[in-house]
């Protein structure tokens, strides 16, 4: 590290003095200091001498000596005060530019350290500082306004108390620039626009920034539109607004509109699409299949997407039967708006009961007319089974009836012993009935099938079981012949709790 002689942090000299600052290093050394007049520099091997033979208040400042060849980059510094009774301040710059929230150094250097106790910072013409101005002072560097704000862009003076009177520095203009985080913020409304030919339309493009220096324009299909600009300032932001008013739209007005704003940080743009139509429209659609199957006791949401212009004048869900004349509860229907022209309507059907199977229709109306979308809801049921013994054409026959949806399959089992349900170990014979007779098959109802098993003689120590199953579940009925006749064992009753 180089050494400055004298090796003290500060020197105080009188105006007119000859000042010599000597810096000694291991290798060559260099001086750096404030821009001030009349310094001469001469080198003598590993030392360098900075000299002036007529020191003035303007020589007040910090002088630093560095050793360029030093890998550690060491330096030594000394601060020179040229104590001028008429000039307590040496102002190094008359304009200071910082960004908001940076510290702003106003470089008025005190020429006499003894005056430090009586210094203050004021605005020009003796005006006090703005409230909440947080500042500190260093006799070497000047006043620092901490975390400067845009509103503190003012002209300042440094004041020192000399012999009971305040002596001011020349003024320093502080410019605090807004920090521009990026291109201006943009809004383009509406985000989408539909109009019938001949109607009026309005498109508003607005941009805002903390700094006034930005441009904004609206373009239609890459053509810049000439629109008068409105400017405003609120919430500490500058706003520029372009409003496009169309009294009677036509097809040539349709297309893509872009709102573009730019500043030194770059460009932002946002777009919308304007559609011009010949007449009102109303389109209903669903992402769901219009034919729905749900297991009894479960829930279902029916969803309809509506695309319409002008807006809907009315809409409702209707139950079209066939079971009852009940209508969906309004509280189970809700509407959500995706955007101006698209809506989703949902009907919630929780814990479906048998009487709620059937057709549900969504109806909507706008000036373009009525539209409807109908869902068909079929409920699925597990099979219910019953077996009776009868004679058909003189032959003993077991008759099994199974009812459920989808249509059940039927299997007969014969097993040894008397049991409520045949297990694998007891099974003597199995018959699959691939084509049971369909007794009833109405829309939205259960399908009832019948299967016949002709038995020449009933074995008394055996059980005959009819089993039915479908995609929902299965059911069975065990038939046990006894000497006094036949005895049937239905399964545990099928319980349904909607």
């Amino acid at each position: 590290i180089p050494v400055i002689e004298p090796s003290v942090p500060e020197l105080v000299v009188k105006p007119g003095a000859t000042v010599t600052l000597r810096c000694v290093g291991n290798g060559s050394v260099e001086w750096d200091g404030p821009p001030s007049p009349h310094w001469t520099l001469y080198s003598d091997g590993s030392s360098s001498i900075l000299s002036t033979n007529n020191a003035t208040f303007q020589n007040t400042g910090t002088y630093r000596c560095t050793e360029p060849g030093d890998p550690l980059g060491g330096s030594a510094a000394i601060h020179l005060y040229v104590k001028d009774p008429a000039r307590p301040w040496n102002v190094l710059a008359q304009e200071v530019v910082v960004f908001e929230d940076q510290d702003a150094l106003l470089p008025c250097l005190l020429t006499d350290p003894v005056l430090e106790a009586g210094v203050s910072l004021v605005r020009v013409r003796g005006r006090p500082l703005m409230r909440h101005t947080n500042y500190s002072f260093s006799p070497w560097h000047g006043f620092t306004i901490h975390r400067a704000k845009f509103i503190q862009s003012q002209d300042y003076q440094c004041s020192a108390l000399m012999g009971g009177r305040k002596v001011m520095s020349i003024s320093i203009r502080l410019k605090v620039q807004k920090v521009i985080p990026g291109p201006p913020a943009l809004t383009l409304v509406p985000a989408e626009l539909v109009r019938i030919r001949g109607e009026a339309a309005q498109i508003v493009c607005s941009a805002s920034s903390v700094d006034v220096n930005f441009d904004v324009f609206l373009q239609h299909n890459n053509t810049k539109l000439a629109i008068p600009q409105q400017s405003d300032f609120h919430n500490n932001r500058y706003q520029k607004v372009l409003t496009l008013n169309l009294d009677q739209v036509d097809f040539q007005h349709a297309g893509n509109y872009s709102c573009v704003a730019s500043n030194v940080q770059g460009k932002h743009s946002t777009s919308m699409f304007f559609r011009v139509v010949e007449s009102a429209y109303l389109n209903l659609s669903s992402e769901q299949n219009l034919i729905q199957e749900v297991t009894v006791g479960e829930g279902l949401n029916l969803k309809v997407m509506v695309e319409a212009y002008p807006g809907l004048q009315g809409f409702n869900w209707t139950y079209l039967g066939p079971f009852s004349d009940h209508q969906p509860e309004p509280k189970l229907a809700n509407a959500t708006t995706k955007d101006t022209y698209r809506h989703t309507f949902t009907l919630s059907l929780p814990r479906l009961k048998p009487s709620e199977a059937g057709r549900y229709s969504f109806l909507a109306r706008n000036p373009g007319g009525w539209r409807a979308l109908t869902f068909e809801l079929t409920l699925r049921y597990p099979p219910e089974v019953s077996v009776i013994w009868t004679f058909i054409n003189g032959s003993g026959t077991l008759l099994c009836a199974a009812s459920g949806y989808p249509q059940p399959n039927v299997t007969w089992l014969q097993c040894s012993g008397h049991t409520d349900r045949c297990d694998e170990a007891q099974v003597l014979q199995v018959w699959d009935d691939p084509y049971p007779e369909v007794l009833s098959q109405e829309p939205f109802h259960k399908v009832t099938v019948q299967s016949l098993l002709t038995v020449e003689t009933l074995e008394h120590n055996q059980t005959y079981e009819c089993r039915a199953h479908n995609s929902v579940g299965s059911g069975s009925w065990a038939f046990i012949p006894i000497s006094a006749g036949a005895h049937t064992h239905p399964p545990d009753e099928f319980l349904f709790t909607p």
């Epitope: 002689e5 090796s7 020197l11 000299v13 260093s138």
Partner: antibody, heavy 121, light 109 residues
Framework: QITLKESGPTLVKPTQTLTLTCTFS??????????VGWIRQPPGKALEWLAL???????RYSPSLKSRLTITKDTSKNQVVLTMTNMDPVDTATYYC?????????????WGQGTLVSVSS | DIVMTQSPDSLAVSLGERATINCKSS????????????LAWYQQKPGQPPKLLIY???TRESGVPDRFSGSGSGTDFTLTISSLQAEDVAVYYC?????????FGQGTK
């Protein structure tokens, strides 16, 4: 009034690092024109300046000991800390911290009582 | 480094007599720009820290009796005790702070 007090170990082993703390009152090391230095005095011998730190964090070291010394300040605690590495029996001395300021021409105008540090295995 | 040499190493003076201690620097400690000599004198009594007596070679520190005075310029300096008192028995050191490292004389007892 200004007072300074040194603290640290009284005995260190050779090759160890010595850490000395100077705790002061009556002035602030954030006030311009103020410094705190360290000076040592082997038993029966003369004074030797070691290091110095100023209000603006400018640090000065004796060139012959620079590689072994580090001086730091904690303005909020009113403390200056000196560390000296690779201690040797010849470093046995009374270590003083002292105040200096612009007013008294940068001489050491207030001294602590000193702390005797012995270096021995 | 600037070498500070004090003479004599030891001095015996009767109470009430003048005592003179010399200090010589190996190079000038006078800074011509402000006409200041960067030299100080300290007094150290047994078991105590040094005490500042004189700075700028001739400016007496506040609270120091006026029997102590400093003089000299450039490379040759003198500390004078005009009328020695019993409490003045001590070791006296000169110190230069013109060029780093700051150096002390070997002391005069």
């Amino acid at each position: 009034q200004i007072t300074l007090k040194e603290s640290g170990p009284t005995l260190v082993k050779p090759t160890q690092t010595l850490t000395l703390t100077c705790t002061f009152s009556g002035f602030s090391l954030s006030t311009s024109g103020v410094g705190v230095g360290w000076i040592r005095q082997p038993p029966g011998k003369a004074l030797e300046w070691l290091a110095l730190i100023y209000w603006n964090d400018d640090k000065r070291y004796s060139p012959s000991l620079k590689s072994r010394l580090t001086i730091t300040k904690d303005t909020s605690k009113n403390q200056v800390v000196l560390t000296m590495t690779n201690m040797d029996p010849v470093d046995t001395a009374t270590y003083y911290c002292a105040h200096q300021e612009r007013r008294s021409g940068w001489s050491f105008d207030y001294w602590g009582q000193g702390t005797l540090v012995s270096v021995s295995s | 480094d600037i070498v500070m040499t004090q003479s004599p190493d030891s001095l015996a003076v009767s109470l009430g007599e003048r005592a003179t201690i010399n200090c010589k620097s190996s190079q000038s400690v006078l800074y011509s720009s402000n006409n200041k000599n960067y030299l100080a004198w300290y007094q150290q009594k047994p078991g105590q820290p040094p005490k500042l007596l004189i700075y700028w070679a001739s400016t007496r520190e506040s609270g120091v009796p006026d029997r102590f005075s400093g003089s000299g310029s450039g490379t040759d300096f003198t500390l004078t005790i005009s009328s020695l008192q019993a409490e003045d028995v001590a070791v006296y050191y000169c110190q230069q702070y013109y060029s780093s490292p700051w150096t002390f004389g070997q002391g005069t007892k």
